[in-house]
């Protein structure tokens, strides 16, 4: 029977009741435009709501917006445009929300031909009060806030300034011009990439990447040659062109662009293209494209220092620069990543790893479900995920896949069950372990979004017609029970919950449309009624992560440590709360090979954990590139994994010696680094 | 079993637009699959105009791409074709087909029988 | 795009007789490659795609093989019910593109 229909399935008492007790309904008072929506702070129930309305005249677009409030996770909503006295907002910028909980919000306006700069609203006490400035530039981004102090913005101007402000937007500096991209950087410092001719379009390749640690007053040319910069955990890329020719290779600096290293990376060409998939402070994954335009590349993971890669995944679909991939990083379980391979057929495929990347497998076929046409053979296939590629191929898939830190194992996607992902309409699976098993939690598609820390999980039907029904599961999925919210079906556009999945507020978004006219309407479902109690003790058992084999002693060490977590059981119907924090037991593990990964110059043949001498490397020196010095590398293949906590065990021999030559490309090199004052 | 209909007017005249639809029976459109259009002009080979999803993603042949637009509704379970500003070397027999299920591949598993398409004034 | 060229543009064979039909691909591939057979009067009919799988009700004496840019179609044992015109069509890269087809006839 269809997930949700099984006898065993216990229906929560009198819902209905409780549910429509707490439905909250809101009728905008406006014309359909668009709509976008904010969550101001954590935990503060403060919901920003901007709708906008174009007109198209014959000489101009005259638009107008509303500003809304809310304060009670959107059950009830005020009209607050009069506080930005009814100015019209670029929703091209959205609505710049502070760090934390800075309670800070910045609106840019909408300015008429001639006026001599853009136009901002601030708010520092979470959209209560607003107050006006006018820019000495008009601004091409956003503001952008140091994530150190919420009182440190940056932005740039359509004239390719660097505009900062020390007081939160009062008073602005412009710092320095032909500026093409710039970004916040730890102990608020500002990196940004400077051009000498013409624009950042004609200097690419040829741009100065430059930093600034005191807001403007003094800065350090970092680099020279550069094509792009990248920031990723402690890491910092710098995409840089080769002397001789078009092709580019990668450095990485871990002390702010101070030394930089060349990355072991294979050089990319002129329509090729480098993306950092994910970083921590442990690691990277990196993404290199292939030569032509094959619509697939390599995924190398990095050793601790960003320098020394591995490679992780052949074949990786990444379509073009700034394209699509599916890479996903699954927040629910440590080590977890899943993402699409283009096969040698042109079909794709599913992959996922446990342990960061260092082994690649496909998702194992759910029970309850059977391999679709894609099969050639009707028992064996796979789980595929639809994720950022389908979307962009406007598949029928209405979401990426979803996981939450604080929902541990939980994973909610789209996906079909064959040889490969299908074109067909897909279901949704649901994995309670990470990615490790699947079933099928709905039929066709839907939207669908965690509560409560995963204690409770919502979904509504992706439907063209209009839909006034909204199914829940308090089990993880195992059941569902459906909830009429309005007698009056609506346009349905999407599904808002406060970031971080442990409100029990939902927000249903839509429209209604009459003979003449149309309106935003909001449904603001509380569930708390429906969890009546607090979790206890007893509605939680000890879950082992990662395991595969109980059996095994070393069962559930991954990246060198195993751990145990208190999970709500599925059976209980309670609050995990608004304060729940995942309780974790780590035990550190023995080391073994599968701890290290293959050091520069070996790789490990597939089904095997050894790591063996690339041949083309045989007999050879091995050496590379650290600090801008040349290094000897004496080992027998192996290297920790960036993060493994593993201890005794295996320990393979390593030793780098300094060859105190110099190796990094020479516009790289500290000594051509200048400094001046403004 | 998908069973696939080609339908319209067997004489267009020069200049004018093409207008074809498929209907499929036996299988619903809105689950599925790439739909495709070929055609064959008289003793000669196929080629391929244009395909489409089920979700209205549509993939043309450049050679046609600018005359070309292939539609889907699901409501009706059929998709069209239209190719405006025929002329006689657009006389062939149409065929509108079922591709496979995988993304990214694109043969064709079931074919409707044709409709011959003559231009002329 | 890429140019699928079909040799012979006719094979005269023997029923009983085995048939081998070639297809050149102007560049690789892969294994992205689907026979086709047609009859007069009649819409073309799938025997093989990814190169060598053989469709659904497609009978075993039909076989595919190559990858790149040489594929072959087999008829192990010519039937009087295989007398048609054979297609190859490649669906690696767009625009999708067919073969100029070859004629098996009765020797």
């Known amino acids: 029977s269809a997930p949700g229909e099984d006898e065993e399935c216990g229906r929560v008492r009198d819902f209905v009741a409780k549910l429509a007790n707490n439905t909250h309904q809101h009728v905008f008072d406006d014309l359909r435009g668009s709509v976008s929506l904010s969550w101001v702070g954590d935990s503060t129930g403060v919901i920003l709501v901007l709708t906008t309305f174009h007109v198209p005249l014959v000489i101009m677009t005259f638009g107008q917006s509303k500003l809304y409030r809310s304060e009670d996770y959107g059950k009830n909503f005020k009209d607050i445009t009069d506080l930005i006295n009814n100015t019209f907002i670029r929703t091209e910028f959205g609505m710049a929300i502070g760090p934390e909980n800075s309670g800070k919000v910045v609106l840019t306006a909408e300015v008429s031909g001639g006026s001599r700069g853009g136009r901002i609203f601030r708010s520092s006490d979470f959209a209560k009060n607003f107050v006006q400035t006018d820019l000495p530039f008009h601004p091409l981004t956003q503001m952008m806030y140091s994530p150190q102090n919420s009182d440190y913005l940056l932005a740039l101007s359509t004239e390719n300034g660097l505009w900062v402000s020390k007081n939160f937007g009062g008073k602005w500096e412009e710092i320095h011009k032909a500026v093409c991209l710039a970004k916040w950087g730890s102990d608020n410092t500002i990196f940004f990439t400077t051009y000498a001719n013409g624009s950042c379009k004609a200097d690419l390749g040829a741009l100065e990447l430059w930093r600034t640690s005191d807001l403007g007053k003094s800065f350090k040319t970092i680099g020279v040659k550069i094509y792009s910069f990248g920031l990723g955990g402690r890491f910092l890329f710098a995409s840089v062109m080769a002397d001789k020719d078009t092709t580019r290779r990668i450095h990485v600096s871990t002390d702010q662009g101070d030394t930089w290293s060349m990355a072991q990376l294979p050089s990319v060409g002129q329509e090729q293209f480098y993306s950092i998939l994910a970083a921590n402070d442990d690691m990277v994954f990196m993404h290199v494209d292939e030569p032509g335009d094959t619509g697939f590349g390599t995924i190398f993971t990095s050793d601790d220092r960003g320098i020394v890669y591995s490679k992780s995944l052949d074949r990786h679909l990444y379509t073009t620069t700034g394209g699509e991939t599916d890479f996903t990083n699954v927040t629910s379980l440590r080590g977890v990543y899943i993402t699409s391979v283009l096969s040698e057929d042109n079909s794709i495929q599913t992959m996922i790893t446990f342990d960061q990347g260092g082994r690649w497998t496909h998702l194992r076929k759910p029970e309850n479900s059977e391999c679709d046409a894609t099969a050639k053979n009707k028992n064996e296939c796979s789980l595929h995920i639809h994720a950022s590629y389908s979307i962009s191929q406007k598949l029928n898939v209405p979401m990426a896949p979803l996981s939450e830190p604080n929902a541990v194992g939980i994973v909610i996607a789209h996906g079909s069950v064959g040889d490969a992902i299908s074109v067909m309409v897909p279901d949704v699976y649901i994995s309670d372990d990470g990615g490790y098993s699947w079933t099928k939690m709905l039929e066709g598609p839907h939207y669908y979004t965690i509560l409560d820390s995963g204690g409770i999980i919502v979904a509504i039907e992706h439907s063209s017609r209009p839909i006034n029904v909204i199914k829940f599961s308090t089990d993880e999925g195992q059941c569902w029970q459906t909830y009429t919210f309005t007698r009056d079906p609506i346009y349905f556009t999407g599904l808002a919950s406060e970031p971080g999945a442990r409100s029990m507020n939902i927000s249903i978004w839509g429209f209604t449309e009459s003979f003449l006219t149309s309106q935003w309407v909001s449904y603001t479902i509380d569930f708390k009624d429906i969890l009546e109690r607090n979790c206890e003790e007893k509605d939680y058992t000890i879950w082992l992560a990662h395991s595969t084999d109980p059996e095994d002693y070393e069962d559930g060490c991954i990246l060198g440590y195993k751990e145990q977590f208190l999970r709500l059981r599925k059976s209980s119907v309670c609050q995990n709360g608004r304060d729940y924090v995942v309780t974790k037991q780590p035990s550190i593990c023995l080391c073994s090979l599968e701890d290290f990964l293959c050091d520069f110059g070996y790789y490990r043949p597939e089904n095997d954990s050894k790591c063996v001498e690339q041949p083309e490397l045989k007999g050879h020196d091995l050496e590379f590139c650290l600090y801008g010095r040349e290094e000897h590398l004496t080992t027998n293949g192996y290297r920790k994994i960036p993060g493994d906590k593993c201890q005794g065990g295996v320990n393979p021999v390593r030793e780098v010696k300094d060859l105190k030559k110099k190796c990094t490309s020479n516009f790289l090199s500290p000594e051509k680094q200048n400094s001046k004052s403004n | 079993q998908v069973q696939l209909q080609e339908s319209g007017p067997g004489l267009v005249k020069p200049s004018e637009t093409l207008s074809l639809t498929c209907a499929v029976s036996g299988y619903s459109i809105s689950s599925g699959y790439y739909w495709g259009w070929i055609r064959q002009p008289p003793g000669k080979g196929l080629e391929w105009i244009g395909s489409i999803y089920h979700s209205g993603n549509t993939y043309y042949n450049p050679s046609l791409k600018s005359r070309v637009t292939i539609s889907v509704d699901t409501s009706k379970n059929q998709f069209s074709l239209k190719l405006s500003s025929v002329t006689a070397a657009d006389t062939a027999v149409y065929y509108c087909?079922?591709?496979?299920?995988?993304?990214?591949?694109?043969?064709?598993?079931?074919w409707g029988q044709g409709t011959l398409v003559t231009v002329s004034s | 795009e890429i140019v699928l060229t079909q040799s012979p543009a006719t094979l005269s064979v023997s029923p009983g007789e085995r048939a081998t039909l070639s297809c050149r691909a102007s560049?690789?591939?892969?294994?992205?490659l689907a026979w086709y057979q047609q009859k007069p009067g009649q819409a073309p009919r799938l025997l093989i795609y990814?190169?060598?799988t053989r469709a659904t009700g497609i009978p075993a004496r039909f076989s595919g093989s190559g990858s790149g840019t040489e594929f072959t179609l087999t008829i192990s044992s010519l039937q009087s019910e295989d007398f048609a015109v054979y297609y190859c069509?490649?669906?690696?890269?767009?625009?999708?593109?067919f073969g100029g087809g070859t004629k098996v006839e009765i020797k």
């Open positions: 990814g190169a060598s």
């Open positions: 087909a079922r591709g496979p299920p995988e993304l990214g591949k694109m043969y064709f598993q079931h």
């Open positions: 560049q690789s591939v892969s294994s992205n």
């Open positions: 069509q490649q669906d690696r890269k767009g625009p999708l593109t």
